[in-house]
Interface confidence: low
């Protein structure tokens, strides 16, 4: 018969596993099996026989099973024996990588690679690699005879660098029992390297400065280098040395700072492996408050006005105010203080207010004083121009330029100009100490001419206080000159004529030159010499004239400068009528008597009177004086018909009478033949 074993001759078993060794026969129906170790030590297993097979089960395998096991099969009288060498090992887990601490760039670190429960160690090899680089390899040959499960380690110390980030540490353990392929003889552990950098180069930037004023603000920004990026923590050092946490942000902003905010501020950059701090000292200084006085360091105030002086404080929350004059005279004003402003109202401003006023501000234990000079002036109205009379060409006139209620007088200048020409200038330099409102005048006399008309007479008053700010510093009044010219060259135009027929119309136009344009006045001279005003129109029109309209008419040109007149005689002619032809003393006289033959035309002036004596041989024109013909010592031949013709441009009228001359001798009348 034959004997066979499974496995055939060698079994590699891992401690703790269950191992079965099988022994079987062929060619023997009822074999008898027995198992023993080569050195007759305990089997440390359980045998089960079944027919032609015997199984030795060792569960679990331990060091007590590391023997050469012999199976003996007895078939009747024959014995067969076959051995199986049981070898044990232990390699149950992957290695473990341990770091002595976090990987900090630049700081040495120990890497420990441990392989637990290994047997046999003399077959163990551990390799430690960083990336592809073998850092260390170790075999454990020294303790070959010890039968125990042990943890074997390999340690390497190295200094990480930034470039190690992302690399892997590989711990590879090999148990050199690889005669049989089925046993995993290599185990490994992998660890990715995370290299840290402890915070360093912590920097604080302070804006605007570490020296600050009360009420100001500061922004402090902190940065720190490290891996991972450090977290930033701001704290303040308290008097007892403790830190008071302020913020977990890189930027710390402190606003409306007070003096108690002075101190040391700490910025700490913190990451997993360390911290780094930087300190900065902030000094909050008491804010230098400022005082402003308005309207300015000096103010020009017009007497009678209301003036408000304002004292304003910046940089002090609750100031106290006081006002005084530089010479500690009464304030003569009303003070009102509220918050950071105080006002002193002087109303109305008078001479007693001409001082330097001081505003004293107290803030805490500090005092500040600001002054304002109140300078007075009075220059309320424009100058007044007055003249002694109207301006008449060639006649002198006195111009007065009056500036009312002026102060200070010593700064006043008055100037009189005609057009661009300065006529007079005066400065009032005296009276410097007088504190009163005065009226000041400039007077001058000049002779106006026609050419001055239309020119401006300017009175300019200047108050020379340029160092005071007020408007106006200059006032002026202007008067346009109109120089009067007395009427002259007065003329009358009569249309159609000054001699007219009764019933016709006449226009009499009067022209007179002067400035201002003369007013025209038409009058008629009455027989008693008085003037009867007729019209103020330049043209006097008479319609349907009558003889009574005849007479002397006067045209008068009148203006402020004088008057000028022109006379015109108007003659209204009518056809002669009411002719009277008389003989005086009678129409019948004696020879030798004196006879006056008189012809009158009572209603018509300007007629020609023609006296004639009619005769057969022809008429004789008699020389008459004013229509009267005197026959001295009448003769008989003087008897006859006398004719009077009253004649003018318009017409004529005849009258006749018969003169009878009686002879003295025979008392006969003599009649001239008709």
């Amino acid at each position: 018969f034959k004997i066979e074993t499974t496995p055939e001759s060698r079994y590699l078993a891992q401690i703790g596993d269950s191992v079965s060794l099988t022994c079987s026969t062929t060619g023997c129906e009822s074999p008898f099996f027995s198992w023993r170790t080569q050195i007759d030590s305990p089997l440390n297993g359980k045998v089960t026989n079944e027919g032609t097979t015997s199984t030795l089960t060792m569960n679990p395998v331990s060091f007590g099973n590391e023997h050469s096991y012999l199976c003996t099969a007895t078939c009747e009288s024959r014995k067969l024996e076959k051995g199986i060498q049981v070898e044990i090992y232990s390699f149950p887990k992957d290695p473990e990588i341990h770091l002595s601490g976090p990987l900090e760039a630049g700081k040495p670190i120990t890497v420990k690679c441990s392989v637990a429960d290994v047997y046999p160690f003399d077959r163990l090899e551990i390799d430690l690699l960083k990336g592809d680089h073998l850092m260390k390899s170790q075999e454990f040959l020294e303790d070959a005879d010890r039968k125990s499960l042990e943890t074997k380690s390999l340690e390497v110390t190295f200094t990480p660098v930034i470039e190690d980030i992302g690399k892997v540490l590989v711990c590879r353990a090999k148990l050199h029992i690889d005669e049989m392929d089925s046993v995993p003889t290599v185990r490994q552990a992998v660890k990715e390297l995370q290299v840290y950098i402890s915070p360093k180069n912590t920097v604080i930037s302070v804006n605007p400065s570490t020296k600050l004023q009360e009420g100001g603000s500061v922004t402090m920004t902190c940065s720190s280098e490290g891996l991972p990026a450090p977290e930033i923590f701001w704290s303040k050092k308290l008097d007892n040395g403790n830190l008071q946490h302020l913020s977990g942000n890189a930027t710390l902003t402190l606003i409306a700072m007070r003096m108690e905010d002075s101190g040391i501020y700490v910025c700490e950059g913190v990451n997993l492996i360390g911290k780094n701090r930087k300190e900065v000292e902030l000094i909050v200084q008491e804010k230098p408050f400022t005082v402003e006085i308005s309207p300015g360091p000096r103010i020009a105030a017009q007497i009678g006005d209301s003036v408000m002086l304002t004292c304003s404080v910046m940089g002090c929350e609750s100031p106290s105010f006081s006002w005084r004059t530089q010479i500690d005279s009464p304030l003569s004003g009303k003070v009102r203080s509220e918050g950071t402003n105080s006002t002193l109202t002087l109303s109305p401003v008078s001479f007693e207010n001409e001082h330097s006023y001081l505003c004293t501000v107290t803030c805490g234990h500090k005092k500040l004083e600001k002054g304002i000079q109140v300078e007075l002036y009075s220059f309320p109205r424009d100058p007044e121009i007055e003249m002694s009379g109207g301006l008449v060409n060639g006649s002198s006139v006195t111009v007065s330029c009056k500036v009312p209620s002026v102060y200070p007088l010593d700064r006043l200048e008055i100037e009189l100009l005609k057009g661009e020409t300065i006529l007079e200038n005066i400065e009032f330099l005296e009276d410097t100490d007088m504190k009163s409102l005065e009226n000041k005048s400039l007077e001058m006399t000049f002779i106006p001419t026609i050419e001055d008309t239309g020119k401006a007479l300017v009175c300019q008053a200047k108050l020379h206080i340029d160092d005071m700010e007020f408007e106006p510093k200059q006032r002026q009044s202007t008067q346009t000159l109109y120089v009067n010219v007395a009427p002259r060259d007065t003329t009358v135009l009569v249309s159609p004529s000054s001699i007219l027929e009764e019933g016709s119309s006449v226009n009499m136009t009067c022209l007179s030159q002067g400035f201002p344009a003369p007013k025209i006045l038409w009058s008629r001279q009455l027989p008693n010499g008085e003037l009867q005003p007729l019209s103020e129109n330049a043209t006097l029109t008479l319609i349907s004239t009558k003889m009574e309209d005849s007479g002397v008419y006067l045209c008068e040109g009148i203006n402020q400068a004088g008057r000028s007149r022109k006379e015109v005689e108007l003659i209204i002619q009518v056809t002669p009528k009411d002719i009277k032809l008389t003989a005086f003393p009678s129409e019948s006289v004696k020879e030798g008597d004196t006879v006056i033959i008189s012809c009158t035309c009572g209603n018509v002036p300007e007629t020609w009177i023609i006296l004639k004596k009619k005769a057969e041989t022809g008429d004789t024109v008699l020389k008459s004086i004013d229509g009267a013909y005197t026959i001295r010592k009448a003769q008989l031949k003087d008897a006859g018909v006398y004719e009077c013709e009253s004649k003018n441009k318009v017409g004529s009228q005849l009258r006749s009478l018969t003169l009878d001359v009686q002879g003295r001798e025979n008392n006969k009348d003599y009649f001239s033949p008709e």
């Epitope: 913020s247 977990g248 942000n249 930027t251 606003i255 409306a256 700072m257 108690e260």
Partner: nanobody
Framework: QVQLQESGGGSVQAGGSLRLSCTAS????????MSWVRQAPGKGLEWVSG????????YYADSVKGRFTISRDNAKNTLYLQMNSLKSEDTALYYC??????????????????KGQGTQVTVSS
């Protein structure tokens, strides 16, 4: 205008508890760090506790660490301070205060800060 109204103060025996509340209005509460500060009789303002905008970071003075808890409810615009194991030295007027922005604690040392009228906490032994 920033308005803060504290409530929840009162008198309590040493070892007892109180919960203070502060209701905020007039500003975007959820954008500001918030603090609790207190003023003991005759003393200056003392910073007690602070919380960041979303409540993820809280900070405490050493004197209250482990006893007080700060929290906030941005939906209700409310800040809380849970005070446990109260001691007589916790007696003070408690104010809630806001910083000037999301990165600032202006009330860290009792300097300027918008704060409410305060709520009185009295702890008797």
């Amino acid at each position: 205008q920033v308005q803060l109204q504290e409530s929840g103060g009162g008198s309590v025996q040493a070892g007892g508890s109180l919960r203070l509340s502060c209701t905020a209005s007039g500003f975007t509460y959820s954008s500001y760090y918030m603090s609790w500060v207190r003023q003991a009789p005759g003393k200056g303002l003392e910073w007690v506790s602070g919380i960041n905008v979303d409540g993820s970071n809280t900070y405490y003075a050493d004197s209250v660490k482990g006893r007080f808890t700060i929290s906030r409810d941005n939906a209700k615009n409310t800040l809380y301070l849970q005070m446990n194991s109260l001691k007589s030295e916790d007696t003070a007027l408690y104010y809630c205060a806001t910083g000037s922005g999301r990165d600032s604690y202006d009330c860290y040392s009792g300097s300027w800060c918008p704060k409410g009228q305060g709520t009185q906490v009295t702890v008797s032994s």
